[in-house]
């Protein structure tokens, strides 16, 4: 016997105090798949939170963050404080890196500087606490009659916080 | 009868975290939302968040969302909470309380008997 | 979010004699669902969507009311009916509460 309720498409629900008709969501409230028994309650995107996409009968409100915080988490489940580059966000708020570590991002945290010596180069600029270090050519490769120079390494890319 | 049997009463320290479980009977587990409610000493009821069994779907108040965790086991019928980084004000009654989405009104039915938790150090 | 204010807080009353216990919304709702709460005890279903008395609720309770103002009435109030009574909406994320209107009978 096929359940009456799987006729119910996205956007309705099916009323089990109705004799299982299918009843269109209620206001604030919406269902994605069809044969639901229950619409569910619109994410409402509020404080530091913003509408990214409004909350339609068939899919739920999208939220991203308002300026100065970015989203972490599945689905933006949470906003986050921007820092600038060059700090790292603690409990006690933007701190700036400490001497050896840099952000070149407005999240995350500070990141050790590349040790240039243990891939037997040399450091071509210094490091700060926005930048990494760039290291240069391994100092044999500076000796006289050295055919060419080794390019520079990439700079590290800093992880990011989880999405 | 329609039933929802809540997990004994827990005590833990400051920072810590607890899980308790309300078991439901007597109904189609899936057929219906189950939400959870803070009762703390003289304060008002405040609502915690919602589970949608059939499909996991949660939807929390904004002042719980960092710290609560809603789940729900189909094949026990059972759906659990879960509340980190524990402080005082958390110390309260909670409620698991069955909601039948379909009237569309989210009222409140049937009520689990509360657990009590203490959080003192 | 919206604030559920109870009126009064606490109301004393003798048998027999007319209750009115007052809800308001701080913006407008669709309808209020009451519950009532003895010591001791998890809250129960009394009223929803405004006027449906919940089962097993004596016909002696009444519920009305619109926009931001409702009420829960009890006609000739009895014994047994000694306890707090709950305001609850969900017209806006999240459900709210009020806080409470405790009846005591004489």
């Known amino acids: 016997l096929q359940d009456p309720c799987s006729n119910c498409p996205a956007g309705t629900f099916c009323d089990n105090n109705r004799n299982q008709i299918c009843s269109p969501c209620p206001p604030n409230s919406f269902s994605s798949a069809g044969g639901q028994r229950t619409c569910d309650i619109c994410r409402q995107c509020k404080g530091v939170f913003r509408t990214r996409k409004e909350c339609s009968s068939t899919s739920n409100a999208e939220c991203d963050c308002t300026p100065g915080f970015h989203c972490l988490g599945a689905g933006c489940s949470m906003c986050e404080q921007d820092c600038k580059q060059g700090q790292e966000l603690t409990k006690k708020g933007c701190k700036d890196c400490c001497f050896g570590t840099f952000n070149d991002q407005k999240r995350g945290i500070c990141r050790p500087w590349t040790n240039c010596s243990l891939d037997g180069k040399s450091v071509l600029v210094n490091g700060t606490k926005e930048r990494d270090v760039v290291c240069g050519p391994s100092p044999a490769d500076l000796s006289p009659g050295a055919s060419s120079v080794t390019p520079p390494a990439p700079a590290r890319e800093p992880g990011h916080s989880p999405q | 009868q329609v039933q929802l049997v809540q997990s004994g009463a827990e005590v833990k320290k400051p920072g810590a975290s607890v899980k308790m479980s309300c078991k439901a009977s007597g109904y189609t587990f899936t057929f219906y939302t189950m939400h959870w409610l803070k009762q703390a000493p003289g304060q008002c009821l405040e609502w915690i968040g919602y589970i949608n069994p059939s499909s996991g779907y949660t939807n929390y108040n904004q002042k719980f969302t960092d710290r609560a965790t809603l789940t729900a086991d189909k094949s026990t019928s059972t759906a659990y909470m879960e509340l980190s980084s524990l402080r005082s004000e958390d110390t309260a009654v909670y409620y698991c309380?069955?909601?039948?989405?379909?009237?569309?009104?989210?009222?409140?039915?049937?009520w689990g008997q509360g657990t009590t938790v203490t959080v003192s150090s | 979010e919206i604030v559920l204010t109870q009126s009064p807080d606490f109301q004393s009353a003798t048998p027999k004699e007319k209750v009115t216990i007052t809800c308001r919304a701080s913006?407008?709702?669709?309808?209020i669902h009451w519950y009532q709460q003895k010591p001791g005890s998890s809250p129960k279903a009394w009223i929803s969507?405004?006027?449906n008395l919940a089962s097993g609720v004596p016909s002696r309770f009444s519920g009305s009311g619109s926009g931001t103002s409702y009420t829960l009435t009890i006609n000739r109030v009895e014994a047994e009916d000694a306890a707090t009574y709950y305001c609850?909406?969900?017209?806006?994320?999240?459900?709210?509460f009020g806080c409470g209107t405790k009846l005591e009978i004489k």
């Open positions: 609850q909406q969900w017209s806006s994320n999240p459900f709210t």
């Open positions: 913006s407008s709702v669709s309808y």
């Open positions: 969507a405004t006027s």
């Open positions: 309380a069955r909601s039948d989405g379909s009237s569309s009104k989210w009222y409140f039915d049937v």
